[in-house]
Interface confidence: low
């Protein structure tokens, strides 16, 4: 009677172990008299010849599929060979692909590090991860690795990185996309510029001056505060750009330094001061505004 190769489990999943046992026929004496060797497709496995009738393959992969058998050699050099057993390693298709971000929430400060983490809930073997930007799908990076997650890193986030992203994972059963993730790049406000707009070249008491404050860079919404010296005159919000304005009816007391502040929750910036001077009225002459 020949040897018997016992494979456990007989239909392994990728990444899992397989135990091979070379079973002696019942008529043979103690296993201790034999040396054993396991083969796959004519290639010896593990340690080669050994006194152990068992061999564990810690991680089976798709490419380990093949024809396996074992041999036993007696002290007298007689070689016994088992029948060949076909082992087909089952690959688990990727499923449940998700794209997550660090920092979480998809909001990153300009200049900070952004990581797009593509994960699959299951899947074995070499998984190819692909990252795409925008609905049209500009391919950013491709990585192939034996892990359930992979990272795409943007070391320094810029305004142009604000987009929708998705990733795709596949391991031979067709691509599986994640959902779209929107990235917002949050930009601190730049130093605002304060402009004074008068209805005429030389404004007089009673005219309405428009103080206009605008930060040219910064994530919206931006809240603007208007100051006379260090006293807050009022505030105005700009939900979507263009700056904000504050109307001021001129009186002689309005002489002094004016400034504005922009704040979008990522930091505040104060403008340079603008000085407005009024002359004390005499006779019929007008009070003129000089800046």
């Amino acid at each position: 009677a020949g040897l018997l190769l016992i494979v456990s489990p007989s239909h392994p999943t990728e990444g899992s172990p397989v135990n091979l046992t070379c079973k002696m026929p019942s008529l043979q004496s103690s296993d201790a008299q034999f040396q054993f060797c396991f083969f796959r497709d004519d290639q010896a496995l593990g340690p080669g010849w050994s006194s152990s009738p068992k061999l564990q393959i810690a991680n089976m992969w798709k490419e380990d599929s093949g024809s396996y058998w074992c041999e036993a050699q007696t002290m007298a050099s007689k070689v016994l060979r088992s029948w060949r057993s076909q082992i087909n390693v089952h690959r688990v298709p990727v499923a449940d692909v998700s794209l997550e971000t660090q920092p979480p929430g998809g909001q990153v400060m300009e200049g900070d590090r952004l990581v797009l983490i593509c994960s699959v809930a299951m899947g074995t073997g070499d998984i190819t991860f692909l990252w795409y930007k925008g609905a049209i799908g500009l391919n950013l990076q491709t990585k192939t690795q034996r892990s359930l997650t992979a990272e795409y890193e943007i070391p320094t986030a810029r305004e142009s990185d604000a987009e929708q992203y998705y990733c795709v994972a596949e391991n031979g059963y067709g691509p599986r996309p994640s959902g779209l993730v929107s990235i917002t790049v949050r930009i601190p406000v730049s130093r605002p510029i304060l402009m004074v707009r008068a209805p005429r070249a030389q404004a007089v008491v009673g005219d309405v001056l428009k103080l206009h404050c605008e930060a040219l860079r910064g994530s919206h919404p931006i809240l603007y505060w208007f100051y006379h010296e260090d006293v807050i005159l009022g505030s105005s919000s700009a939900p979507s750009g263009g700056g904000a304005s504050f109307n001021l009816s001129l009186t002689a007391e309005h002489s002094g330094n004016y400034s504005c502040e922009a704040n979008n929750g990522l930091g505040a910036q104060r403008s340079e001061e603008v000085t407005l001077n009024f002359t004390v009225p005499t006779g019929a002459r007008s009070n003129h505004l000089t800046s």
């Epitope: 979480p104 998809g106 034996r146």
Partner: antibody, heavy 117, light 112 residues
Framework: QVQLQQPGAELVKPGTSVKLSCKAS????????MHWVKQRPGQGLEWIGR????????KYNEKFKSKATLTVDKTSSSAYMQLNSLTSEDSAVYYC??????????WGQGTSVTVSS | DIVMSQSPSSLAVSVGEKVTMSCKSS????????????LAWYQQKPGQSPKLLIY???TRESGVPDRFTGSGSGTDFTLTISSVKAEDLAIYYC????????FGSGTKLEIK
């Protein structure tokens, strides 16, 4: 079952280096990031860094960038952390820990490092 | 870095009592895309390595008794032990993993 095996203790002299090991078993080593955590006697937990066993890419806590170096050996399913220029401040228990979905789900028993002349 | 603050630093309770401990983060740990909070709770018994109890702020790790419950969202989180057992004597740490991991300083649970 998942196991992370670490040596119990290391006694080292100031100014020298030590390489701590962490042997993983019971799971596919390359699929999960390995993190290292420091705990000084009677103190809390402090993250040192992490390594992706698949690519070998590592990230460090800024505080430990010049102190620790993380490596892996895929063939032996082992992770290593080398600590250099040791001082008494480095005397602590060092844990390796596997990370799954962000949380540290399996921990080694820790290696106690004592820096003493 | 995200700073994690735990309170109280220690508490002593009798067996069978209910215990709550707090963990606050310096910024939100809630990820809007999946509505998950990137927060875990660990138990460290004397002379042992830490053990994962709760992840995603409220998901109990396999094998953890159901007397342990995690709750909270955003920046405020709570670990509750519904009926303390003598074996629960330990230090409990919260940890965020929305960025490079940081731990709270721990809450030491003592049994009266």
């Amino acid at each position: 079952q998942v196991q992370l095996q670490q040596p119990g203790a290391e006694l080292v002299k100031p100014g020298t280096s030590v390489k701590l090991s962490c042997k993983a078993s019971g799971y596919t080593f390359t699929r999960y990031w390995m993190h290292w955590v420091k705990q000084r006697p009677g103190q809390g937990l402090e993250w040192i860094g992490r390594i992706d066993p698949n690519s070998g890419g590592s990230k460090y806590n800024e505080k430990f960038k010049s102190k620790a170096t993380l490596t892996v050996d895929k063939t032996s399913s082992s992770a290593y952390m080398q600590l250099n220029s040791l001082t008494s401040e480095d005397s602590a228990v060092y844990y390796c820990t596997r990370v799954n979905s962000g949380a540290m789900d399996y921990w080694g028993q820790g290696t106690s490092v004592t820096v003493s002349s | 870095d995200i700073v994690m603050s735990q309170s109280p630093s220690s508490l002593a309770v009798s067996v069978g009592e209910k215990v709550t401990m707090s963990c606050k983060s310096s910024q939100s740990l809630l990820y809007s895309s999946n509505q998950k909070n990137y927060l875990a709770w660990y138990q460290q018994k004397p002379g042992q390595s830490p053990k994962l109890l709760i992840y995603w702020a409220s998901t109990r790790e396999s094998g953890v008794p159901d007397r342990f419950t995690g709750s909270g969202s955003g920046t405020d989180f709570t670990l509750t032990i519904s009926s303390v057992k003598a074996e629960d004597l330990a230090i409990y740490y919260c940890q965020q993993y929305s960025n490079y991991p940081t731990f709270g300083s721990g809450t030491k649970l003592e049994i009266k």
